[in-house]
């Protein structure tokens, strides 16, 4: 008789899940020097520790601490971009500008990009048919509480000027509800932080609006502000040519607005 | 009978080293991160250091960085701190301890070692 | 100087409820768990993970957690109760800190 098995509204674990988490760590160990000290099966022993067993709607920050512990790296606290709602173009950026990191330019935030995983209350099986959906089912799911983790200690290290890269194509530039806005705009340290820099990806080729100077950045204006941390906004009209410029900056057309 | 023994303490001058070993029993010791633990006379707990279950990963207090290493052999089931350079303020009881599935708690305790650094 | 900061002593009398509580930054995202160490013998483990007990410790023991405080209640006190009493957690470093301990005395 099968067993009786809860059905969530999300998708269930990533196929070969245990598998690209260990292959991803030997991966990202190999390419960065100074993370080639990290064992990379007790990283997944910490990893699978933080849900194993544990009801998929009762995951806590507490849980994945041994995980943090085993992934904690030192990044430049001033080279920190953040992203909201752009994962790619931001993804884009560092990979051109390599002296600056997004969370999922980190060991931690690589090994689960992508990726979903939950398990079961009181049994060590992975489940692969259902997740909870952080909407529908719950928000302390293994997975949203794994980036809250992680996205609150990697604000928490930043310092100087942070840079943040929004989307100027949704209807909420800045949203309080996106992990940046929910978690990492409140865990940057004003004693650390001088300036929070935002860059307002635009969508459209012919769009010319300044959109620093949109409701909503107004709004994430108002709540870095009231942090002690200064704010600045820039925007980006041509996101293909602002790559360019960065992988170029000699080029005589990067001079310009872009 | 799950049990921790520590051995090794004694009396040792300033500058000097020592060797601590814990032996484990009753339990699967690979499986488990262990830690060192210190009380001074009258005073309270002090965490020292831990090691990871494979023992590729290692963690100390600021006050013994650099001077203590902490080490396993999981063959033979045993835990050591080595202490090198000790200092008047390293005299303590140090207990070595089971985590309980890493952060826990702390589940099983020795009985202790006392260690005194006089001249 | 400690984390988690705890009360040097608290008292009651046999039969009474009393409160050990601890507080410190860093038990808002970490388990906390609390050890008994009765006089010239090792701690032993009270509650674990917030506040679920081991086997073998009476139900008169129970815990709390909410914040960045956390706390211990011993009902019933009885006269073999009077023992120091130890929160810990791990830090923001994510290293073990142990409060400063509670001397609970029975009167």
């Known amino acids: 008789v099968p067993r009786w098995r809860q059905q969530w509204s999300g998708p269930g674990t990533t196929k070969r899940f245990p598998e690209t988490v260990l292959a991803r760590c030997v991966k990202y160990t190999e390419i960065h020097p100074e993370m080639r000290h990290v064992d990379c099966q007790s990283v997944w022993d910490a990893f699978k520790g933080a849900f194993i067993s544990k009801h998929p709607c009762n995951i806590t920050e507490e849980d994945y601490q041994p995980l943090m512990k085993l992934g904690t790296q030192t990044v430049p606290c001033n080279k920190i971009l953040l992203w909201s709602r752009i994962k790619d173009l931001a993804h884009q950026f560092t990979q051109v500008q390599r002296d600056m990191f997004t969370l999922e330019d980190t060991l931690l935030g690589y090994l689960a990009d992508d990726l979903t995983w939950c398990g079961e209350f009181n049994t060590s099986k992975i489940n692969y048919q259902s997740c909870p959906d952080w909407r529908k089912d719950c928000s302390n799911n293994p997975v949203s509480v794994f980036w809250k983790t992680v996205s609150r200690r990697f604000a928490e290290a930043a310092c100087d000027v942070v840079h943040v890269m929004l989307n100027g194509s949704r209807s909420k530039i800045f949203d309080k509800n996106s992990t940046f806005g929910s978690v990492e705009v409140h865990n940057l340290q004003p004693e650390k932080v001088q300036t929070l820099e935002a860059w307002v990806i635009h969508g459209g080729r012919e769009d010319s609006r300044d959109l620093c100077q949109d409701p909503t950045i107004k709004e994430l204006e108002s709540i870095i502000s009231k942090r002690n941390i200064q704010f600045s906004c820039k925007n980006i009209y041509r996101p293909d040519k602002f790559l360019q410029c960065v992988k170029n900056p000699e080029d005589s057309s990067c001079t310009s607005e872009i | 009978e799950v049990q921790l023994l520590e051995s090794g303490g004694d009396l040792v001058q300033p500058g000097g080293s020592l060797r601590l070993s814990c032996g484990a029993s009753?339990?699967?010791?690979?499986?488990?991160?262990m830690s060192w633990v210190r009380q001074a006379p009258g005073k309270g707990l002090e965490w020292v250091a831990d090691?990871?279950?494979?023992?590729?990963?290692?963690w100390y207090a600021d006050s013994v960085k650099g001077r203590f290493t902490i080490s396993r052999d999981n063959s033979e089931n045993t835990l050591y701190l080595q202490m090198n350079s000790l200092r008047a303020e390293d005299t303590a009881v140090y207990y070595c301890?089971?985590?309980?599935?890493?952060?826990?708690?702390?589940?099983?305790w020795g009985q202790g070692t006392t260690v005194t650094v006089s001249s | 100087q400690s984390v988690l900061t705890q009360a040097p002593s608290a008292s009651g009398t046999p039969g009474q409820r009393v409160t050990i509580s601890c507080s410190g930054s860093s038990i808002q995202n970490n388990y906390v768990s609390w050890y008994q160490q009765l006089p010239g013998t090792a701690p032993k483990l009270l509650i674990y993970r917030n506040f679920e007990r081991p086997s073998g410790v009476p139900d008169r023991f129970s815990a709390s957690k909410s914040g960045t405080s956390a706390s211990l209640a011993i009902s019933g006190l009885q006269s073999e109760d009077e023992a120091d009493y130890y929160c810990a957690s791990w830090d923001d470093s994510l290293n073990w800190v142990f409060g400063g301990g509670t001397k609970l005395t029975v009167l």
């Open positions: 009753g339990f699967t010791f690979s499986d488990h991160y």
């Open positions: 301890a089971k985590n309980w599935n890493y952060n826990y708690g702390m589940d099983v």
């Open positions: 090691i990871s279950a494979r023992g590729s990963n290692t």
